[in-house]
Interface confidence: low
């Protein structure tokens, strides 16, 4: 099924409009902003949340402008282009005719330009690394645990195949969280990394996108794991393309 | 050729404000993040603060942020630092640097000459 | 703040011999460090870039090696011209931040 029978509602996407108007009445949702039909089984695509997150009105968004913590993704938020499948479109435009290319995940990868600036291809997002601080504790977590926590979340909150969490890396009070997923490891129905670290990001913000489920409460061995920031940087297949002699 | 030029330096009397411009040629500063750092005499550099000229967005260091203002003027491809309640201990070469986007890049790959500011009565 | 503290303040190095200058950095920055040197009047130079990346057109005898919190700047052999101050900076996050530099003399 692609959404919960009895209330209509998606699991996996709240920044969705669903009615009993699919085949046989079955319930079907639609997401905010671009009324594209989505997979309720599994998570929504990223550039679809953006998409949504930006035609919410302004007092019912409860994500503002990242801080500028948000270290890579520092353009902050913008109202994309998504393509049939829901994916990025490799170039973005604002509405006033600047324009940049983006990688698989939405993060701008080459200068801003004009309308003339051409961006070939989708380049894929490969490698995530999710950097966490949390809150002082009593005693360091056990690694161990730590890790084995952070893959069934990843797995059973987000779907994402164990084999794509590549490391746990843990230094008191740092913790890496090491996706990858290179284009041919990503089988049909795999949930795309970029969009389980954008899920997690979420969460951890206690901006939750899952359908009436409580927020994410992240213990090891009963100890709750409270993260005080998040910092995310992607590595593409193609090394962005800014226009610094390095990179020439 | 890649090249950022400061301007404004000079002696400043205490309590007054300083103005400093930076322009650039053989890059469009719309592209970059322009900064601003600093290095007192005989000292190590201080990083100041940063503006993204395409939309404005600044990043002050905490330790000015209630007297520096960072503003663009992309139709001359520059960005001007303004400083206000100058202090002796605020006597230094302030440099202009530009970085990328994204973290990854936000190293100094091209620097000013450099402009010396003396304040003192 | 991320602190950045290097060792040692001042290297006296024979020409022809190598030099290690270290970093540390106060918390985690992953490979987000750079290294800059500054000759005396003149402008910092970028030499070195995520850690280990060699900036165009730096000598190969300069390399960068490190991740987390401990960073080293090697010059495998010193050269007269290398006379400089060295400095690390971290580009992980804002505010950014330098050390506090190291004199690299010749012995």
């Known amino acids: 099924h692609t959404a919960a029978q009895d209330n209509c509602t998606c699991p996996t996407n709240k920044m969705t409009v669903c009615s009993p108007d699919g085949p046989g009445g079955r319930c079907q949702c639609r997401a905010l902003g671009s009324g594209m039909a989505v997979d309720c089984s599994t998570l929504t695509s990223k550039c679809l949340l953006l998409k949504a997150r930006m035609s919410a009105p302004k007092n019912a968004r409860t994500l503002v402008r990242p801080s500028e913590h948000a270290l890579v993704d520092n353009d902050g938020l913008y109202d994309p282009d998504c393509d049939p499948e829901g994916r990025f479109k490799a170039r973005q435009c604002n509405q006033t005719s600047v324009c940049w290319c983006v990688n698989s995940v939405g993060v701008r990868r080459t200068d801003k330009g004009d309308l003339s600036l051409r961006c070939d291809e989708l380049v894929r997002t490969h490698h995530i690394l999710i950097d966490l601080r949390h809150r002082p504790t009593a005693g360091a977590f056990n690694h161990s645990d730590l890790d084995a926590e952070l893959r069934r979340l990843f797995r059973e909150r987000y779907r994402l195949h164990p084999k794509f969490v590549a490391a746990v890396h843990y230094e008191q009070p740092t913790i890496q969280i090491e996706l990858r997923q290179n284009t041919s490891q990503k089988a049909a129905g795999d949930v795309d990394i970029g969009d389980a670290a954008y899920y997690f990001e979420r969460d951890i913000k206690g901006e939750s996108l899952f359908q009436g489920r409580g927020g994410l409460d992240l213990r090891v061995r009963g100890e709750p794991l409270q993260v005080e920031r998040t910092l995310i940087y992607y590595l593409d297949e193609i090394p962005p393309k800014f226009s610094m002699k390095r990179l020439t | 050729e890649v090249q950022l030029v400061e301007s404004g330096g000079g002696l400043i009397q205490p309590g007054g404000s300083l103005r400093l411009s930076c322009a650039a040629s053989?890059?469009?500063?719309?592209?970059?993040?322009m900064n601003w750092v600093r290095q007192a005499p005989g000292q190590g550099l201080e990083w100041m603060g940063r503006?993204?000229?395409?939309?404005?967005?600044?990043h002050y260091n905490q330790k000015f942020k209630d007297r520096l203002t960072i503003t663009k003027d992309t139709s001359k491809n520059q960005v001007v630092l303004t400083m206000t309640n100058m202090d002796p201990v605020d006597t230094a070469t302030y440099y202009c640097?530009?970085?990328?986007?994204?973290?990854?890049?936000?190293?100094?790959?091209?620097w000013g000459q450099g402009t010396t500011v003396t304040v003192s009565s | 703040d991320i602190v950045m503290t290097q060792t040692p303040l001042s290297l006296p190095v024979t020409p022809g011999e190598p030099a290690s200058i270290s970093c540390k950095a106060s918390?985690?920055?992953?490979?987000?460090v750079a290294w800059y040197l500054q000759k005396p009047g003149q402008s910092p130079q970028l030499l070195i870039y995520?850690?280990?990346y060699r900036y165009t057109g730096v000598p190969d005898r300069f390399s960068g090696s490190g991740s987390g919190t401990d960073f080293t700047l090697t010059i495998s052999s010193l050269q007269a011209e290398d006379v400089a101050v060295y400095y690390c900076?971290?580009?992980?996050?804002?505010?950014?931040?330098f050390g506090q530099g190291t004199r690299l003399e010749i012995k």
């Open positions: 918390q985690d920055v992953s490979t987000a």
């Open positions: 900076q971290q580009h992980y996050s804002t505010p950014l931040t």
């Open positions: 640097a530009r970085s990328g986007f994204g973290s990854t890049y936000w190293f100094f790959d091209v």
């Open positions: 995520s850690a280990s």
């Open positions: 503006i993204d000229p395409n939309d404005s967005e600044t």
């Open positions: 053989g890059f469009t500063v719309s592209n970059y993040w």
